[in-house]
């Protein structure tokens, strides 16, 4: 399908001239940022962004790649080097330390310098590094964390936690020896390390003692509380804060976000991770866009501004399953949240960054026709005389042999939301990838986001833009509408 207008060179010259005109008009804002928003697409490598762009375009009955995503409209872009101190290919814990704290760490550790060792509790103390969110709170801003995973998961935990093992969600996950040495589980750190104004996502089960039935799944023991210390962390959190409210479903969230008496809000909508967007019960669970909107409503009441972390966390899970349909539909919802946040904030006073913590071994190739389904088949046959999909994985659970050979695939199979794209190597989970990821930026000091940078640069740009530690002497004019 070739659009007739695209056959004409004038079409491309005009389009490029418009883009050039917009580029020439770009004026770096010399003011500080009142608000900081970091949108983190977990596992959202560049191939994921491209494929999601096409899918989102096709959902609007367009050919696909020509329709920009919300993140594509951000004027400044850089590449981020995602390696961990000890691994070429990183995990979400140590990368969170990099882009949220500005210091690289070791694989599967969170909020700690590389002097700390994975799983060794006694290497924690003295190696803690402080997140930009924590620094924003100390500067009088309101702060919030929004995610589609558990709020205790690796990426959101980077905003508040310090742990040598990202899997220590509740005290039941922490070895007795580490508990005796004083290492705290991530859920405990969520409520005690700092005062977070808005916490929205999954992860109910880590907050309640073992045997506490889940309100949504009361008959399912496996979804109930997991804590061994007998604590009710939600109750403890509420007791420490006047104007605090806990909600566990969409209706309660909407009510709370509109209630001016609510100053602190914790919404935990699933026992574990939130459901994939395609499986979400829209009457019970809010979407990422709705959670983002609710968070912004509360946080923007603070005249000193806010820091907000928004994670599309299950892009990563879709990829680990080798289910591109899940990864890409999660990416589209993530982009919808970015778009909505853009409507609710001003680029005059809000620095918004969009990035990924790491990529995945997810590829998009095979010369498909323009306008053909992103989940479809490549033209022609492979060497084994069988069809193959344009989306593939380098490794993962999509490796299957039927009678000792690669299975053939049809368009109807590959279009199913449950379909696992094929891979070259069989693994229980498809792996992260080590190539650089994109950083998109808009707002005050966004022009600093350029070139190829260490992932740690992201935290430093945010801190500098808002004149937070260690850049309190930033020498930037205050943003419009700020009150001291």
């Amino acid at each position: 399908i070739i659009p007739v207008e695209e056959e004409n060179p004038d079409f491309w010259n005009r389009e490029a001239a418009e883009a050039l005109g917009a580029a020439k008009k770009l004026q770096p804002a010399q003011t500080a940022a009142k608000n900081l928003i970091i949108f983190l697409g977990d596992g959202m490598g560049v191939s994921t962004v491209t494929a999601a762009r096409i899918l989102k375009g096709q959902k609007k009955d367009k050919l696909g790649p020509e329709i920009p995503l919300a993140m594509d409209r951000f004027p400044y872009v850089a590449l981020s080097k995602t390696y961990n101190v000890d691994k070429h290919v990183p995990d979400s814990g140590a990368t969170a330390t990099a882009y949220l704290c500005g210091v690289k760490g070791n694989f599967q550790t969170i909020g700690l310098s590389a002097a700390a060792r994975f799983n060794q509790c006694n290497t924690t103390r003295g190696n803690e590094v402080i997140s930009v969110m924590n620094r924003a709170k100390k500067a009088g801003k309101s702060v919030g964390v929004v995610t589609t995973t558990r709020v205790q998961h690796a990426s959101p935990a980077g905003t508040y936690a310090h742990t040598v093992n990202r899997n220590w969600y509740s005290d039941a996950d922490v070895p007795a020896s580490a508990r005796q040495e004083g290492c705290q589980d991530i859920a405990t750190q969520l409520i005690s390390n700092m005062d977070i104004d808005v916490i929205l996502g999954g992860g109910r089960k880590y907050m309640f003692r073992m045997g506490t039935p889940d309100p949504e799944y009361p008959d399912d023991y496996s979804q109930g509380g997991t804590r061994l210390d007998g604590k009710n962390l939600v109750q403890e959190w509420l007791a420490k804060r006047q104007g605090a409210r806990y909600v566990w479903n969409r209706t309660e969230l909407m009510q709370a976000s509109l209630d001016p008496s609510v100053t602190h809000l914790m919404g935990l909508f699933e026992p574990g991770d939130m459901k994939y967007e395609i499986h979400r019960d829209s009457t019970l669970d809010p979407s990422l866009m709705e959670m983002t909107e609710a968070a912004l409503r509360l946080l923007s009441r603070n005249p000193r501004g806010f820091f907000l972390f928004v994670e599309g966390g299950r892009i990563d899970h879709g990829h680990h399953e080798s289910r591109a349909y899940r990864a890409l539909t999660e990416t589209i919802m993530f982009d919808d949240a970015i778009e909505r946040a853009g409507q609710l904030t001003s680029e005059e006073d809000t620095l918004s960054l969009v990035t990924a913590d790491h990529s995945h071994v997810f590829s998009f190739g095979g010369y498909p026709l323009r306008g053909s389904s992103i989940f479809g088949l490549a033209p022609g046959k492979a060497r084994d005389r069988k069809a193959y999909t344009v989306l593939l994985y380098g490794n993962g659970p999509g490796y299957v042999l039927k009678d000792g050979a690669r299975p053939d695939v049809t368009e109807s199979e590959s279009g199913s939301p449950e379909y696992r794209q094929q891979s070259a190597v069989p693994l229980d989970e498809e792996t992260h990838a080590g190539e650089d990821v994109a950083v998109f930026a808009r707002g005050p000091q966004a022009h600093l986001v350029h070139g190829v940078q260490e992932q740690t640069f992201i935290a430093h740009v945010m801190a500098f833009a808002a004149c937070l530690e260690p850049y309190t002497a930033c020498d930037l004019a205050p943003p419009a509408g700020t009150t001291d």
Partner: nanobody
Framework: QVQLVESGGGLVQAGESLRLACAAS????????VGWYRQAPEKQREWVSS???????DYAEAVKGRFTISRDNAKNTVYLQMNSLKPEDTAVYYC???????????WGQGTKVTVSS
């Protein structure tokens, strides 16, 4: 030291069911995928099933629709419900933990399943 201990094996007739369990010492299951392999006499060890930390399951073609994997993180236990057993399911079944980025592997000692026709 991490230990994985399988149980539940035995001798059954074709068409019957068994439920295998694998309990881990310590907290090794937290955040990791876990699963089962099997090894029939004179054959190579073959993968059977796995489950991620958030519950996504996967099965070998030979057992799809008959076997169901589940996990109880609170009990550090993974289960394999085996229905409509066939003589070709006869093997020693081993549970394992898949740790991202680790070269060290954790395996149990195995539990023997014999299906007679």
């Amino acid at each position: 030291q991490v230990q994985l201990v399988e149980s539940g094996g035995g001798l059954v007739q074709a068409g019957e069911s068994l439920r295998l369990a694998c309990a881990a010492s310590g907290t090794i299951f937290s955040g990791n995928a876990v699963g089962w392999y099997r090894q029939a006499p004179e054959k190579q060890r073959e993968w059977v099933s796995s489950i991620t930390d958030y519950g996504d399951t996967d099965y070998a073609e030979a057992v799809k629709g008959r076997f169901t994997i589940s996990r109880d993180n609170a009990k550090n236990t993974v289960y394999l419900q085996m229905n409509s057993l066939k003589p070709e399911d006869t093997a020693v079944y081993y549970c394992y933990v898949y740790q991202r980025g680790e070269s060290e592997e954790y395996w149990g000692q195995g539990t023997k399943v014999t299906v007679s026709s």
